[in-house]
Interface confidence: medium
């Protein structure tokens, strides 16, 4: 778009006539205050379009913004709209008139606003005052727009001097309204109800003086209206609540309940929805899997957790080997069932410093008048391995034996290793593993016993060494899923007098 003369600001004489031309690659139009002006449009042979605006008998009231824009595009892109500001200095016009709504400036937050007092002559000095004060306020002035800044809730006037007379503008009133961006919260006494129970929902708005509530709900769609109740919770900061109450719910009342709130000052609106489920009868459902075999480590605390959904709230019982469990006064067992959401529960059995006797068959049962569920598992107590004995002996057969005894649960695994060069073992010489059947130098015999009462395995392993010709560092290492332990003994040849 090309405007001639280009502006962006023109100062024209009162009573004169002035011609403005705008041209572009599509039909163009001149506008002022969002209205098309009387103008002459033309199309040239080179397919350029133009519009000529003739301003005749100019007065101060012709002061203002003029726009040239492509017809029907309404300035989709910045370069599809050109702005021109015209001043017509006119001593008979003081301040340009404002529409009534421009005199009342409503604020909903602390923000910069413009008091739009404008004059026809850009050379005039304009000052801003509180309506009841003479002192000029230090606020920047733009002849095309007015005074811009952050203003308090007061009345303001603008002043200028034209010739030798002082001229006042109309008064501008700044009001700060209690309006916030609408933030709606919706909640229900229960989102799951059985048929015949009540549905009660609340929609709350905070920080607005005037709002309008509208509810959408399944019954409304079938033409059965429910009258909501609206009340004020607190005077400040304006808590307004709308309550929707449906007595004796039916299965058809399941669905989405939406609260829509609007406020008229800024035309803000917000809506929130909540789902309500009406069930024929109550339920209890397990969530997730709990393995049939659970483990706990001896002398450590272990929490066994079951997650389930239920409505209405259930009774929860725990059993061990078919005997009911309760919180022990000694603090060895703790039972808790937490409501983690409206219908979701976590039931926990905590065994404090687990003992061997606590191994066994555990069951959790959750029930109410409509349904029940139970879950069972076996608890195995894992005991870290420990080497109880490592001893060396010299049977008459001439061979030397090393016996290693240890216990643990699950069954310990035994590893024999040895180092011949004591000074360099094990840093520079890795220990050699013993007891492989292919080696004639050593033989291994291992026996495993399960001790029912202690609920753990005992491993006894005997290593037979055939030819010990120099001191040998022999190590017995036990390991299982929850630990490792080891002991070492120095085996010396028969001929040496020391150990």
């Amino acid at each position: 778009l090309v405007i001639t003369p280009p502006g962006p600001e023109l100062i024209l004489n009162v009573s004169s006539t002035f011609v403005l031309t705008c041209s572009g690659s599509a039909p163009v139009v001149w506008e002022r205050m969002s209205q098309e002006l009387p103008q002459e449009m033309a199309k040239a042979q080179d397919n350029t379009f133009s519009s000529v605006l003739t301003l005749t008998n100019l007065t101060g009231l012709d002061t203002g913004e003029y726009f040239c824009t492509y017809n029907d595009s309404r300035g989709l892109e910045p370069d599809e709209r050109k702005r021109l500001y015209i001043f017509v200095p006119d001593p008979t016009v003081g301040f340009l008139p404002n529409d009534a709504e421009e005199l009342f400036i409503f604020l909903t937050e602390i923000t910069e606003i413009t008091i739009p007092c404008r004059v026809t002559d850009p050379q005039l000095v304009v000052t801003l005052h509180e309506k009841k004060g003479d002192i000029a306020l230090p606020v920047p002035y733009d002849h095309q727009r007015g005074f811009s800044g952050i203003f308090e809730d007061r009345s303001y006037i603008c002043k200028t001097t034209i010739g030798d007379r002082e001229v006042d503008s109309d008064a501008y009133y700044v009001y700060r309204l209690q309006v916030s961006s609408i933030n709606v919260s919706v909640n229900a006494v229960q989102t799951v109800v059985r048929q015949g129970e009540n549905i009660t929902l609340m929609c709350i708005v905070i920080g607005n003086e005037v709002v309008n509530f509208e509810w959408m709900y399944p019954r409304k769609e079938s033409g059965r209206l429910v009258e909501p109740v609206t009340d004020f919770l607190l005077d400040m900061p304006y808590h307004i609540r709308s309550i929707l109450h449906i007595p004796s719910a039916e299965l058809e009342d399941s669905g989405t309940y939406t609260c829509n709130v609007t406020e008229s000052v800024n035309d803000h609106q917000d809506e929130k929805a909540i789902n309500i489920t009406v069930v024929e009868s109550g339920y209890v459902r397990l969530l997730g899997e709990v393995g049939a075999l659970q483990f706990a480590e001896l002398h450590r605390s272990r929490t066994l957790q079951v997650v389930f959904e239920a409505y209405p709230p259930p009774t929860v019982l725990w059993f061990k080997d078919n005997r009911t469990l309760g919180d022990s006064s000694a603090g060895e067992i703790a039972l808790s069932t937490r409501n983690v959401s409206e219908t979701r529960y976590v039931s926990e059995l905590t065994l404090v410093r687990v003992k061997v006797a606590e191994a066994g068959h555990y069951t959790m049962r959750a029930f109410h008048e409509d349904a029940e569920v139970q879950l069972s598992f076996q608890l195995q107590i894992n005991v870290p391995v420990r080497v109880l004995e490592l001893s060396e002996s010299h049977p008459d057969s001439g061979e030397q034996t090393v016996r290693c005894r240890g216990r643990g649960m699950p069954q310990p695994n035994i590893i024999w290793s040895a180092c011949r060069d004591l000074k360099r073992c094990p840093r520079e010489l890795p220990p050699m593993l013993l007891g492989n059947s292919s080696e004639e130098e050593s033989q291994l015999e291992t026996n495993v016993t399960y001790w029912e009462e202690e609920q753990e395995f005992e491993v006894v392993s005997t290593l037979r060494l055939q030819h010990v010709d120099r001191p040998l560092s022999v190590r017995c290492t036990l390991r299982n899923a929850v630990g490792q332990d080891m002991q070492e003994v120095i085996v010396v040849p028969h001929s040496l007098p020391f150990k």
């Epitope: 290492t477 899923a481 490792q484």
Partner: antibody, heavy 118, light 106 residues
Framework: EVQLVESGGGVVQPGRSLRLSCAAS????????MHWVRQAPGKGLEWVTV????????YYADSVKGRFTISRDNSKNRLYLQMNSLRAEDTAVYYC???????????WGQGTMVTVSS | DIQMTQSPSTLSASVGDRLTITCRAS??????LAWYQQKPGKAPTLLIY???SLESGVPSRFSGSGSGTDFTLTISSLQPDDFATYYC????????FGQGTKLEIK
């Protein structure tokens, strides 16, 4: 030259996951047990987890049990630490270290920093 | 779990000094104990293993002793390069470190 090089550290939000890697060179990786040890800023060393030379046994410190998983790929000479459900208290430099069965940690990596912060 | 307690937590010394750091285990660990040195921003390095065996490449001014529950690390003549933090570690049953001893220049 016997060497361990950690990678994969970084800044992560609480509750998120991270996977650390340790590349071994200069020794027969598949013969050795491998450990992860960590050190919180300005604090001491804390043993985290171990994996046997063949991957048959894995042990974890109580503070990471159920959240961290150690693994290894002997064909690639690599050790891994998968860290899930991370907490602020997991913020530390993480070292991988070589430690044979019943032996001290003779080779350490240079460490990789893990910061858990929202 | 086996706990390891080091003392002192901080130690001020001068070059040429002879000094001892002690480490106590909450239960017997035989001689399954190692000592490490760590400098700021670096990984630890092994000094002593099996309570008294010197790791190869470690200067002979470092020595370790002890068995059962009480152990010591001795530096016979302190060198400028020795100012660092020292940790003991048991590896009999699982693996646990002492809290560290910081060696500072007096």
């Amino acid at each position: 030259e016997v060497q361990l090089v950690e990678s994969g550290g970084g800044v992560v939000q609480p509750g998120r996951s991270l996977r650390l890697s340790c590349a071994a060179s200069g020794f027969t990786f598949s013969n050795y047990g491998m450990h992860w040890v960590r050190q919180a800023p300005g604090k001491g060393l804390e043993w985290v987890t171990v994996i046997w030379y063949d991957g048959s046994y894995k042990y974890y410190a109580d503070s990471v049990k159920g959240r961290f998983t150690i693994s290894r790929d002997n064909s690639k000479n690599r050790l891994y630490l998968q860290m899930n459900s991370l907490r602020a208290e997991d913020t530390a430099v993480y070292y991988c270290a070589r430690g044979e069965l019943g032996d001290a940690f003779d080779i350490w990596g240079q460490g990789t920093m893990v910061t858990v912060s929202s | 779990d086996i706990q390891m307690t080091q003392s002192p937590s901080t130690l001020s010394a001068s070059v040429g000094d002879r000094l001892t750091i002690t480490c106590r285990a909450s239960q017997s660990i035989s001689t399954w104990l190692a000592w490490y040195q760590q400098k700021p921003g670096k990984a630890p390095t092994l000094l002593i293993y099996k309570a008294s065996s010197l790791e190869s490449g470690v200067p002979s001014r470092f020595s370790g002793s002890g068995s059962g529950t009480d152990f010591t690390l001795t530096i016979s003549s302190l060198q400028p390069d020795d100012f660092a933090t020292y940790y003991c570690q048991q590896y009999k049953t699982s693996w646990t470190f002492g809290q560290g001893t910081k060696l500072e220049i007096k």
